[in-house]
């Protein structure tokens, strides 16, 4: 902790400006008013403070706001955000999407840090649900964000937010997560016509039940093998050879290359050989 010493005559800071980079740590402590700093946080980012100087500035804010910074300060933290611990962030009440964006921008290009994860958690809990604008923002910064949530957390995503989800946002989701997201997607896209509906729902089909796959097989959707391989095994097993043929359309030939992998392997073992032979792919049940 920096020792408390009187501010030298004439050095009391009236503004947060460039001159402060020449202040020693003890001078910053003694001469920079915490309330002034809180008010002019937006200026800190334009000044090349050292890490040690930033520690002093953070200490001053912590002393003024030990129970958590007000949002007016949080929004302008800039790179001082990188000095915050998850414990600091848990004290915050962040309600503005602009504040969230400003802080995510600071961490842009890096992996999601514990600080960012805590910030997002505080923000989402404060809002009560993952609304579309929030999801848009989070997936723009962290494409894998959605798949980092537990099924319980995903249950708070309203169907309307599903419109913000891009296929790549679901790349790392496991079946349990897709089980939660699929019904929401189905609800969100229910008023779309056949081909448009399939384009939108395709990424979520890893959570689809058998009856929905059967329904899709009647719509000439031509599902690609990559999507088929992500389907739930228990949903694929009851499908007939004819239904799989209709579901995959021209992509059915790809089954041969995947015959040793789930769910294709398990599905083949459930079929009558006569039915498999109708595909002319040499699949052995």
């Amino acid at each position: 902790e920096v020792e408390k010493t009187a501010c030298p005559s004439g050095k009391k800071a009236r503004e947060i400006d460039e001159s402060l980079i020449f202040y020693k740590k003890w001078e910053l402590e003694a001469c920079v008013d915490a309330a002034l700093l809180a008010t002019q946080m937006d200026r800190v980012n334009a000044i090349p403070f050292t890490y040690e100087q930033l520690d002093v500035l953070k200490h001053k804010l912590d002393e003024l706001y030990p129970q958590g910074y007000p949002e007016s300060v949080i929004q302008h933290l800039g790179y001082l955000f990188l000095k915050m611990s998850p414990e600091d962030i848990r004290k915050w009440n962040v309600t503005s999407l602009e504040t969230l964006k400003a802080l995510l921008e600071v961490n842009k290009g890096h992996e999601m840090s514990p600080q960012v994860a805590t910030l997002i958690d505080r923000f989402v809990k404060g809002r009560g649900q993952l609304d579309k604008d929030t999801l848009d923002t989070l997936t723009a910064f962290y494409p894998g964000y959605l798949c980092s949530l537990s099924p319980e957390e995903l249950s708070s995503v309203p169907p309307s937010s599903i419109w913000a989800v891009r296929p790549q946002d679901l790349d790392t989701c496991d079946p349990r997560q897709l089980d939660v997201l699929y019904p929401k997607a189905r609800l969100a896209f229910q008023n779309m016509n056949g081909s448009e509906y399939f384009v939108k729902i395709q990424s979520f089909l890893g959570g689809a039940p058998t009856e929905d796959l059967k329904a899709l097989s009647q719509q000439n959707v031509s599902m690609d093998l990559a999507t088929f391989m992500k389907l739930r095994t228990d949903a694929v097993l009851p499908l007939t050879v004819a239904e799989v043929q209709k579901l995959l359309g021209p992509h059915v030939e790809g089954l041969k290359a995947e015959e040793r992998h789930r769910p294709v392997r398990d599905w083949i073992l459930r079929q009558r050989q006569d039915d498999l032979d109708t595909l002319g792919l040499g699949l052995q049940g």
């Epitope: 915490a34 309330a35 002393e63």
Partner: antibody, heavy 114, light 110 residues
């Protein structure tokens, strides 16, 4: 979470006195604590604060007249020599946020008289 | 040290009316201003901190505003239980100007 002051009594001028602020449910390593006083029928007056690091800050008029110290559950206010002007109810309070104090004790009355 | 000047010294308002109390700091205290309510024989009770943030348990009819040297506490739709003395408190213990209270405003509810 509560705060209670004790040690207030009738004393003669020049007498030293120690007031004790006892906290319950408040971790003094997480909260700064302040001392204030209020003369009968008058307004509130700030004496000083001890922060979580143990550093003490005093109002300019109180420097040399009072000493603030703490243990793990108490915060003491020592006055080496009281005068009639020090007659007041003394309050201890928890520093909260943004310059404010949120949990106040009921106060302890100090009367300095011949 | 910062000096806080509070006006008026007293205010009388019927139930349902609006009370406005002003507080002026001798130098800029930015947003570091709190308002307290005190009833006879009781300690002060925190109402507002950081100029405009309502303290936990404080009724929403209390509103704080201002910045720098000029601050206002407004009580809209004043109730009988609001009869008390109100103090502004400016400044911050860790900085050179320290903490100072306004002289108080006694609010009488008719």
């Amino acid at each position: 979470q509560s705060v209670k002051e004790s040690g207030g009594r009738l004393v003669t001028p020049g007498t030293p006195l120690t007031l004790t602020c006892t906290v319950s449910g408040i971790d003094l390593s997480s909260y700064a604590m302040g001392w204030f006083r209020q003369a009968p029928g008058k307004g509130l007056e700030y004496i000083g604060t001890i922060n979580i690091g143990g550093r003490v800050y005093y109002a300019s008029w109180a420097k040399g007249r009072f000493t603030i110290s703490r243990t793990s559950t108490t915060v003491d206010l020592k006055a080496p020599s009281l005068t009639a002007e020090d007659t007041a109810t003394y309050f201890c309070a928890r520093y909260y946020n943004g310059g404010s104090y949120d949990i106040w004790g009921p106060g302890t009355l100090v009367t300095v008289s011949l | 040290d910062v000096v806080m000047t509070q006006t008026p010294a007293s205010a009388s308002e019927p139930v349902g009316g609006t009370v406005t109390i002003k507080c002026q700091a001798s130098e800029s205290i930015y947003r570091v201003l709190a308002w307290y309510q005190q009833k006879p024989g009781q300690p002060p009770k925190l109402l507002i901190y950081d100029t405009s943030t309502l303290a936990s348990g404080a009724p929403s009819r209390f509103k704080g505003s201002g910045y720098g040297t000029e601050f206002t506490l407004t009580i809209s739709g004043v109730q009988c239980e609001d009869a008390a003395t109100y103090y502004c408190q400016g400044g911050y213990y860790a900085d050179s100007y320290g903490i100072a209270f306004g002289g108080g405003t006694e609010v009488v509810v008719k």
